[in-house]
């Protein structure tokens, strides 16, 4: 039994890090493998993660972590019974994938303006709370070509767009994701999408 693709890990910079790897053949990850992880400092405890299957030869492990700080560094040991298959380390602050934003809402009651709001996925004391920027994806359910991305580079989790920049009388969906430039993070997963019917009054034309 050998590791084909070494574990790569990402952290949500709060409570979970996720590690994925591939074995050289079909593996029952939960019965055959264990990933041990330990914070590097005196008297720290070793924790055991039981991996789950992620495709035939793929394994994934969710490592529970206490409130991450930038100095945290973990040793990782991948075991198959008594055999050490791989040894490595992981610094959560250097491999951040933010949590996905939540509670995406489209407010259509503002005259001819769409207001999209969502929630920051971090509590105010978390470092990422004040460092997230967002991308909002809006697309038409009727027309696959009607697909647009709005970059929200300010901190407020909201976006205003003129309703007339979208077609009237059809349904649209929106979703949002986040990243943090300060830690050069990857993008978060997309939030669940929300749907609305876009309609607005055409301006009265005078001749």
């Amino acid at each position: 039994m050998k590791v084909l693709q070494e574990p790569t890990c990402v952290s949500d910079y709060m409570s979970i890090s996720t590690c994925e790897w591939k074995m050289n053949g079909p593996t029952n990850c939960s019965t055959e493998l264990r990933l041990l992880y330990q914070l590097v400092f005196l008297l720290s405890e070793a924790h055991t993660c039981i991996p789950e299957n992620n495709g035939g030869a793929g394994c994934v492990c969710h490592l529970l972590m206490d409130d991450v700080v930038s100095a945290d560094n973990y040793t990782l040991d991948l075991w198959a019974g008594q055999q050490l298959l791989w040894k490595g380390s992981f610094k959560p602050s250097e491999h951040v994938k933010p949590r996905a934003p939540g509670n995406l809402t489209v407010h259509t009651n503002v005259s001819d303006t769409l207001l999209l709001t969502w929630s920051n996925p971090y509590p105010p004391d978390n470092y990422l709370y004040n460092h997230l920027t967002y991308a909002v994806n809006i697309w038409s359910e009727n027309d696959p070509a009607d697909f647009r991305i709005y970059n929200v580079t300010y901190l407020e989790p909201s976006l205003r767009i003129a309703a007339r920049t979208l077609k009237s009388g059809i349904s649209y969906r929106a979703r949002v994701r986040a990243w943090a430039q300060c830690y050069n993070t990857t993008w978060s997963e997309w939030s669940p999408s929300t749907k609305w019917h876009n309609s607005y009054r055409e301006p009265f034309e005078q001749h």
Epitope: S15, F41, S44, E52, L64, M65, D66, D67, D125
Partner: antibody, heavy 115, light 107 residues
Framework: QVQLVESGGGLVQPGGSLRLSCVAS????????MNWVRQAPGKGLEWVSY????????YYADSVKGRFTISRDNAKNSLYLQMNSLRDEDTAVYYC????????WGQGTLVTVSS | DIQMTQSPSAMSASVGDRVTITCRAS??????LAWFQQKPGKVPTRLIY???SLQSGVPSRFSGSGSGTEFTLTISSLQPEDFATYYC?????????FGQGTKVEIK
Amino acid sequence: QVQLVESGGGLVQPGGSLRLSCVASGFTFSHSSMNWVRQAPGKGLEWVSYISRATGAVYYADSVKGRFTISRDNAKNSLYLQMNSLRDEDTAVYYCAREPVFDYWGQGTLVTVSS
Amino acid sequence: DIQMTQSPSAMSASVGDRVTITCRASQDISNYLAWFQQKPGKVPTRLIYAASSLQSGVPSRFSGSGSGTEFTLTISSLQPEDFATYYCLQWSSYPRTFGQGTKVEIK
């Protein structure tokens, strides 16, 4: 081995105050965020409060906000819950529980609020 | 605040039965969900975290699934020591919230 021992519970009248303590051993307390969780007699679990190891930030359940204060003394390996303006509905066994996500619990201390 | 609704609140089952308990969140919590077991007079112990990750030392007959708002705890073959109360917990955001509990009793 990890051990959490709560104390300070007892009988108190409505409107009164009580201070609970939780002494930790078997791990580096200063590196762990901590919680208080309670359970009213014959009822379910209710999260009460959290204090971060990293920032010292605190969070509270709405039911205790403004009345309870969580604090810690890393030099004494101790977690505290100051409970003021106690009500009948605060009667419960109070547990301290360690992060991440309540991996270790103390045995609990009973707080009874009654006249 | 996020509400967690567990069902059923109580159930009777026999040794060897397959038992399923569900937990519904009032809004999307991704996979930030844990399951705890509590026996009478005892302290709760964590069975599952991150919706589907088995806690080390917990028997493999316990499994968790789900993401977003719908979650399930399954006991594939109920054993005598599994008669207890089970709670789900969301830790996606503060305040953290538990489900109201599911008591699994002997039929």
